[in-house]
Amino acid sequence: TPEVWVQVQMEATELSSFTVHCGFLGPGSISLVTVSWGGPDGAGGTKLAVLHPELGTRQWAPARQARWETQSSISLALEDSGASSPFANTTFCCKFASFPEGSWESCGSLPPSSDPGLSAPPTPVPILRADHHHHHH
């Protein structure tokens, strides 16, 4: 069964900078990736970036740079302009879509005990919701 993993990392040198890493574990090719924060895509989350494997990326503040790391993983750099570092308590979600086979989404956040520069373990945190025939979690 395909899975999505999410890691959130605080930069050691810039405490206001975070990077979200997401990857897809499974067969098939990815047609689109969406990254959101504050909840899952289409369920209260706010869009941060959309990445197409061939046609480029689109991103919205506070996203700074979205890019493909491999054919099945992406990274999103975020710049936190606020002094209170709200990213530390925020949930980030990544959805990998493979048309028309299905889409898979997981969420993750920076662990409360994280030291700067340490990343969260790559454990997928499935979003539980009513299943929809091609949306697998």
Epitope: S31, L32, V50, G56, K95, F99, S103
Partner: nanobody
Framework: HVQLVESGGGSVQAGGSLRLSCEAS????????MGWFRRAPGKERDEGVA????????KYADSVKGRFTISHGNGKYILYLQMNSLKPEDTDMYYC??????????????WGQGTQVTVSS
């Protein structure tokens, strides 16, 4: 979460017509385009049969221009595809999808289970 439900597919003779409908519900729509897609035979990427973006720009695949018409119903979350002068090569599973525009093309982010269109000669 998103629920995109298509209807209107079926079997028809060449030259006939069908009207596909799509209703989106339970969806906090944050994309910028919607459309009808098919998995084109022999192609790795999806083919946008007919798409419409938030600015009202409509785009058709060359193979359906002049025969198919995409339109919104009463509200943003109802989409139609009027298919006229159908040909056997139009036979496929048709998916209603919401997505994002890249380079003028709508790329699906969410889609329904599809509705089968079969055109016999």
């Amino acid at each position: 979460h998103v629920q995109l439900v298509e209807s209107g597919g079926g079997s028809v003779q060449a030259g006939g017509s069908l009207r596909l409908s799509c209703e989106a519900s339970g969806y906090s729509y944050s994309g910028d385009c919607m459309g009808w897609f098919r998995r084109a035979p022999g192609k790795e990427r999806d083919e946008g049969v007919a798409t419409i973006d938030n600015a009202g720009r409509i785009k058709y695949a060359d193979s359906v221009k002049g025969r198919f018409t995409i339109s919104h119903g009463n509200g943003k979350y109802i989409l139609y595809l009027q298919m006229n002068s159908l040909k056997p090569e139009d036979t496929d599973m048709y998916y209603c999808a919401a997505g994002w525009t890249f380079g003028g093309n709508c790329s699906p982010a969410d889609w329904g289970q599809g509705t089968q269109v079969t055109v016999s000669s």
